[in-house]
């Protein structure tokens, strides 16, 4: 088994106020086994914003189909962007157990809020 | 409450073809991946074939491979799995069950009983 | 294929463990309870641990290396079944079950 590696490929991402934000993130392996979870934010103040074990998350969708077997996918749209919502979001791969317990995270994708056009 | 009720169970003999659907209701059908499994009389159960939400994507037993095809309609909550080159082990209950974000199974039909017999 | 005991045994209010090995660390194991043949499976335990929302609490599971456990504290008389394990692998994309374990409740 090929070295997890987490590829968020974007530093950054600018969305007006209103709008919907695309954040990228893809896997290279299955394994080990567990869940993505997204964060906006690091350390214990971090906020959850998708965990693909759990839901509903109102206003994230993913943007690939999570339902296939074989998915590495895990982009996500996080509609209705308000101020509130800037930060710097992490992908991050946890492995399974009693809890699950993080394995690896992305460099992370830093969303800014335009003002809403006039 | 999540349902699902499965038809198109029958005697047919061995050589032909048959169609079984599951009818979904109580959840969203089209943000689930779906499958089949069966259960020939006295035995244990067996993982038939799995789809994705979309339907995009399909999945196989090395037992039906070849002879049978699953797929969805999402504008009509139903589920398919078509057989074909019937044979006596084909003989089971077959169910289709909701997978969970692992692609194990939270719910499961009543089942319908194909008999393949000359 | 996993591997489950054929049959286990116990008087009311005992705990009963029954554990299922083979799935090797890629998997996610659960639990499927069928009172009578040919019925409808009940989920009991699905993602290792994860007990439905209308599932009683004196089922629970586990999962360590390759094994799952799955434990019934307190058993019942209505408990009588077949339990069946199930796994998902990653490496092949496949569902696989246990030939099932027969509980009997003296």
């Known amino acids: 088994e090929e070295e997890l590696q987490i590829i968020q490929p974007d530093k950054s991402v600018s969305v007006a106020a209103g709008e919907s934000a695309i954040l990228h993130c893809t896997i290279t392996s299955l394994f080990p086994v567990g869940p993505i979870q997204w964060f906006r934010g690091a350390g214990p103040a971090r906020v959850l914003i998708y965990n693909q074990r759990q839901g509903p998350f109102p206003r994230v969708t993913t943007v690939s189909e999570t339902t296939k077997r074989e998915n590495m996918d895990f982009s996500i749209s996080i509609s209705n962007i308000t101020p509130a919502d800037a930060g710097t979001y992490y992908c991050i791969k946890f492995r399974k157990g009693s809890p699950d317990t993080e394995f690896k995270s992305g460099a992370g994708t830093e969303l800014s809020v335009r003002a809403k056009p006039s | 409450d999540v349902q699902l009720v499965e038809s198109g169970g029958a005697v047919v003999r061995p050589g032909e073809t048959l169609r079984l659907s599951c009818t979904a209701s109580?959840?969203?059908?089209?943000?689930?991946?779906m499958s089949w499994v069966r259960q020939a009389p006295g035995k244990g159960l067996e993982w038939v074939s799995g789809i994705s939400a979309s339907g995009s994507d399909t999945y196989y037993a090395d037992s039906v491979k070849g002879r049978s095809t699953i797929s969805r309609d999402n504008s009509k909550n139903t589920l398919y799995l078509r057989m074909s080159s019937l044979t006596a082990e084909d003989t089971a209950v077959y169910y289709c069950?909701?997978?969970?974000?692992?692609?194990?199974?939270?719910?499961w039909g009543l089942g319908t009983l194909v008999t393949v017999s000359s | 294929a996993l591997t489950q005991p054929a049959s286990v045994s116990a008087n009311p209010g005992e705990t009963v463990k029954i554990t299922c090995s083979g799935g090797g660390t890629s998997s996610y194991y659960g639990w499927y309870q069928q009172k009578s043949p040919g019925s409808a499976p009940v989920t009991l335990i699905?993602?290792?641990?994860k007990r439905p929302s209308d599932i009683p609490s004196r089922f629970s599971g586990s999962a360590s290396g390759s094994t799952a456990t799955l434990t019934i504290t307190g058993v019942q008389v209505e408990d009588e079944a077949v339990y069946y394990c199930g796994g998902y692998d990653y490496t092949t994309y496949v569902n696989t079950f246990g030939a099932g374990t027969t509980l009997t409740v003296l």
């Open positions: 069950a909701r997978e969970t974000w692992n692609h194990l199974f939270d719910y």
């Open positions: 699905h993602s290792d641990d």
């Open positions: 109580g959840f969203t059908f089209s943000s689930y991946a």
